[in-house]
C-alpha cells in the first residue's frame, strides 16, 4: 500500500485541461525530494514526462507543469490541450528514480460526444441563455408548438404555445417565432443551471404528422483557471461575464463551507480580511472587470468565483467565472513589515521591495481608499508629481541595485493612518501593502529644528540647527532640500561629534545648515534626517521663507555666522550656496504635463553639491559621513 495518494481515475474530453493533485507524507525529505510524473509503458518502464528538477518531455512541451506545495505536502501536475493520445496509465511519485514512492493514475481522454444526425447539440455555460431552434413543415404552421425534456422514457413539457410553462422554467423559458418565418419556432431558456442539461424534444403538431427535433443541451460548470502565486505577491482576477450582465452588480466571492462568501462587490460590500489590499476595477462598458488582491497570505488559497447579479451576491443561474488560487510559501518576495507605526508630528520611513532585476522600473506609492470598489491614487512616484497636501512632507528615495526603495512621510497626522501600496510599473507581483498607524505623540520629537519660524533674508547668511538625541550619535545626519522630485541631500561639513559616545551631551548634539548668501530660490521645505547607509530613519521638516532685506535690518557678516558654528564643538555644520541651475529640476510644462524629470538618488547628491566651501569652519572641505 503506497503512502502516496491521488486520483485513481481521471476522465476528460479532448481539448480540456486536467490538474492532478498527488499527496505525500509530510516529512522533510519528502518535501525536498524530486517529484515526477511518468507514463507506464507495456514493458513495465515508466518514462518521465515532467519532474520538479526541471525536466519536461517533448510531448509535454508548452502544455504541462509540475508544482510542489511543500506546506500542503502535495504536488500538482497540470496538463493542457488533451488529446486521445494522452489516454493511458501514469504514476505520480517521489524519489530520484521512477521506482520510488508512487501512485497509479489512469487518465482517459474521450472524444467530444457525438449524437445522432437529427440531434442538435447546444453547449452553454451556467447562467447563460440557450436558443433552441425547432423546424417544422408548413402543414403544422397553425398547430401547437412545444418543447419537452426527456426523463427516462417520459418527456415532460417545458413550455408550449398555449402559454403553459413548467414551474422550474418559470420566467426563464419563452417560445417565440421570428419575423415572418413559417417553418421555425424558437425556445429561449435563460439563467441555465446544471440540472437543465439533458435531451429535449421540440414538436409542432400532434400524432404521426407531428414534426420533431432532438436537442441535447450541455450546461458547463465553469472550469476553474488555475492560478499559482507566491506568498506576499499579488493576483488579478480578470472577469468577463458578457454584455447581458453589463448593468448588473458584480462580485468576487470565495467558496466556503456553506456558500460562496463575497469578498468584494460593486455595491460597496468588502470582506474585512481584504481591507487595504483589494481593488475592483471596471474595465469597460461590456461588464468586464478585474479584482486585484495584494499581499497574498497562505489562507487566501482556495476557490474563487466572480459573477453578476443585481443583489451583488451569488445567485444560481447567473453567469460565473471560476479560479483556483494556490499560494506558494517558497516566495521570492521578501518579508517586509506590514504595519508601520508613527506619532503625530513625527515621520516614518517605509521600505518598499521590488524585483531586483527591474531596478530601472518606475516606483510608486499610493494610498488605498476604501470608497466602494477601493482605489489607490498615487501620492508619489519616480515620474509622478507629489500629490497636493503632501508637498514638503513626502519623498521617494530610490536605491538602485538594492531591490528596495524608501518612502519617507513626515509631519504625520492621524489622518495619515491607513493602507498604502508600494508598486512599480514592472513585475506586478511585487506589490506590497503597508498599514500606517499614527498615534497621538506623548513626548517631544527626536529631531527638533531651531528657529521654528524660519525666515531668511536675501543676501544674508541664514543658519538652521537640527537637534538630535544621543541615540542618533553614530548615524549619518543630513539636511536636504525638498522638491517635487525628491529631497536632494545638501553638502555637509563635519565639524562636530568629536567627543566619545560615552560622554555624549544630550543638549549639544546639533547638525546645522547654512545658506550663504540667501537667494530667492532657497525658499522652500528643508528636511533634517538621520540614516545608516541606505537605511533611512527619522526626519523632520521646516519651511524656510525668503524675503527681501528691509531698510534698517542688521546685516550679518557671513564669517561671524560661521564663527558661531565653530564655537559649538559638538555641532555638524552644513553649508550651501546652491546656485539656481544646480538645485532646480528642469521642468518644461509642455513636455511634462503630469510628469517630471528625474535623477536617481546618487545623481541628486552629486548635482546638489554646494559650490565650494567658502566660509566653512577652519576652511576645511566638506565631507559627508
Amino acid at each position: 500500500q503506497s503512502p502516496i495518494f491521488g486520483p485513481q481515475d481521471v476522465s476528460s474530453i479532448e481539448g480540456n485541461s486536467v490538474s492532478i493533485t498527488c499527496y505525500y507524507p509530510d516529512t522533510s525529505v519528502n518535501r525536498h525530494t524530486r517529484k515526477y510524473w511518468c507514463r507506464q509503458g507495456a514493458n513495465g518502464y515508466c518514462a518521465t514526462l515532467i519532474s520538479s528538477n526541471g525536466y519536461l518531455s517533448k510531448e509535454y512541451s508548452g502544455r504541462a507543469s509540475l508544482i510542489n506545495f511543500p506546506e500542503n505536502s502535495t504536488f500538482v501536475i497540470n496538463i493542457a490541450h488533451l488529446t486521445q493520445e494522452d489516454t493511458g496509465s501514469y504514476k505520480c511519485g517521489l524519489g530520484t528514480t521512477n521506482r520510488g514512492l508512487f501512485f497509479d493514475v489512469s487518465l482517459e481522454v474521450s472524444q467530444v460526444p457525438e449524437f445522432p444526425n437529427d440531434t442538435h447539440v447546444y453547449t452553454k455555460d451556467i447562467g447563460r441563455t440557450v436558443t433552441i431552434e425547432c423546424r417544422f413543415k408548413e402543414g403544422n404552421a397553425h398547430s401547437k408548438k412545444s418543447l419537452c425534456k426527456k426523463r427516462g422514457e417520459a418527456c415532460e413539457v417545458v413550455i408550449d404555445s398555449t402559454e403553459y410553462v413548467d414551474p422550474s422554467y418559470k420566467d426563464r423559458a419563452i417560445l417565440f417565432m421570428k419575423g415572418t418565418s413559417r417553418d421555425i419556432f424558437y425556445v429561449n431558456i435563460s439563467h441555465l443551471i446544471p440540472s437543465d442539461a439533458g435531451l429535449y424534444v421540440c414538436q409542432a403538431g400532434e400524432g404521426p404528422s407531428a414534426d420533431k427535433n432532438n436537442a441535447d443541451l450541455q450546461v458547463l460548470e465553469p472550469e476553474p483557471e488555475l492560478l499559482y502565486k507566491d506568498l506576499r505577491s499579488s493576483v488579478t482576477f480578470e472577469c468577463d461575464l458578457g454584455r447581458e450582465v453589463a448593468n448588473d452588480a458584480k462580485y468576487l466571492c470565495r467558496k466556503n463551507k456553506e456558500t460562496c462568501d463575497v469578498i468584494i462587490n460593486t455595491l460597496g460590500k468588502r470582506d474585512p480580511a481584504f481591507e487595504g489590499r483589494i481593488l475592483l476595477t471596471p474595465r469597460d462598458d461590456n461588464g468586464r472587470f478585474s479584482v486585484l488582491i495584494t499581499g497574498l497570505r497562505k489562507e487566501d488559497a482556495g476557490h474563487y468565483q466572480c459573477g453578476a447579479h443585481s443583489s451583488g451576491l451569488p445567485q444560481e443561474g447567473w453567469p460565473v467565472q471560476a479560479w483556483q488560487l494556490f499560494v506558494n510559501e517558497e516566495s521570492t518576495i521578501p518579508n517586509s513589515r506590514s504595519v508601520v507605526k508613527g506619532v503625530t508630528g513625527g515621520s516614518v520611513a517605509i521600505v518598499c521591495p521590488y524585483n531586483p532585476k527591474e531596478s530601472s522600473s518606475l516606483k510608486y506609492w499610493c494610498h488605498w481608499e476604501a470608497d466602494e470598489n477601493g482605489r489607490c491614487p498615487v501620492l508619489v512616484g519616480t515620474q509622478a508629481l507629489v500629490q497636493e497636501g503632501y508637498e514638503g512632507r513626502l519623498a521617494l528615495f530610490d536605491q538602485p541595485g538594492s531591490g528596495a526603495y524608501t518612502v519617507i512621510l513626515n509631519q504625520l497626522t492621524t489622518q495619515d493612518s491607513g493602507f498604502y501600496w508600494c508598486l512599480t510599473d514592472g513585475d506586478s507581483r511585487w506589490r506590497t501593502t503597508i498599514e500606517l498607524q499614527v498615534a497621538e505623540a506623548t513626548k517631544k520629537p527626536d529631531l527638533e529644528v531651531t528657529p521654528q519660524n524660519a525666515t531668511a533674508v536675501i543676501g544674508e547668511t541664514f543658519t538652521i540647527s537640527c537637534h538630535y538625541p544621543c541615540k542618533f550619535y553614530s548615524q549619518e545626519k543630513y539636511w536636504c532640500k525638498w522638491s517635487n522630485d525628491g529631497c536632494h541631500i545638501l553638502p555637509s561639513h563635519d565639524e562636530g561629534a568629536r567627543q566619545s559616545s560615552v560622554s555624549c551631551d544630550q543638549s549639544s548634539q546639533i547638525v546645522s545648515m547654512t545658506l550663504n548668501p540667501v537667494k530667492k530660490e532657497d525658499e522652500g521645505w528643508y528636511w533634517c534626517g538621520v540614516k545608516e547607509g541606505q537605511v533611512y530613519g527619522e526626519t523632520t521638516a521646516i519651511y524656510v521663507a525668503v524675503e527681501e532685506r528691509t531698510r534698517g535690518s542688521p546685516h550679518i557678516n557671513p564669517t561671524d555666522a560661521n564663527a558661531r558654528a565653530k564655537d559649538a564643538p559638538e555641532e555638524e555644520a552644513m553649508e550651501s550656496s546652491v546656485r539656481e541651475d544646480e538645485n532646480k529640476a528642469n521642468l518644461d510644462p509642455r513636455l511634462f504635463a503630469d510628469e517630471r524629470e528625474i535623477q536617481n538618488a546618487g545623481d541628486q547628491a552629486q548635482e546638489n553639491r554646494a559650490s565650494g566651501n567658502a566660509g566653512s569652519a577652519g576652511g576645511q572641505s566638506g565631507s559627508s559621513k
Epitope: 495518494f5 486520483p7 481521471v10 458547463l220 460548470e221 476553474p224 463551507k257 460562496c260 476557490h303
Partner: nanobody
Framework: QVQLVESGGGLVQAGDSLRLSCAAS????????MGWFRQAPGKEREFVTT??????????YYADSVKGRFTISRDNAKNTVYLQMNSLKPDDTAVYYC?????????????????WGQGTQVTVSS
C-alpha cells in the same frame, strides 16, 4: 444549503453487489466534490471514495480497501452520485454516508466536507 439523501442500502450476501445513490438538492451549484464515507459500529468514520469535478473533467479517488471493487459515478443532470459496490465482503458492513464539499484540499479528510446525508445501512452477511 445543500441537502443530501442516500438510498439503496440493504442486506446482501458476501460476493453480491449493491448500488447506493445520493441525490443532492438546494445550492448544488456551489459543490465541487461528492463522496462516500462509512462507519462501522465502534469505529471511526472512514473514507471510501470521492468524485470531484471541474467542468467536464472528473477525478475519482478510492481507499485502498475498495479499489477495483467499488466505482463512483455521477449524473450531472440529476445532481446524483452513485456508488456501485461489487464483490462485497462482511468487512464492508457499515453505515454509508454521502458527503459534499465546496472546497476540497484532501478528499480523505471528513472535516473537508461541508454537507452530510443521514446515512444508509449496508449489511454484508457471510
Amino acid at each position: 444549503q445543500v441537502q443530501l439523501v442516500e438510498s439503496g442500502g440493504g442486506l446482501v450476501q458476501a460476493g453480491d453487489s449493491l448500488r447506493l445513490s445520493c441525490a443532492a438538492s438546494g445550492r448544488t451549484f456551489t459543490t465541487y466534490g461528492m463522496g462516500w464515507f462509512r462507519q462501522a459500529p465502534g469505529k471511526e468514520r472512514e473514507f471510501v471514495t470521492t468524485i470531484t469535478w471541474s467542468g467536464s473533467t472528473n477525478y475519482k479517488y478510492y481507499a485502498d480497501s475498495v479499489k477495483g471493487r467499488f466505482t463512483i459515478s455521477r449524473d450531472n443532470a440529476k445532481n446524483t452520485v452513485y456508488l456501485q459496490m461489487n464483490s462485497l465482503k462482511p468487512d464492508d458492513t457499515a453505515v454509508y454516508y454521502c458527503a459534499a464539499s465546496t472546497v476540497l484540499r484532501d478528499p480523505r479528510v471528513p472535516t473537508e466536507y461541508d454537507y452530510w446525508g443521514q446515512g444508509t445501512q449496508v449489511t454484508v452477511s457471510s
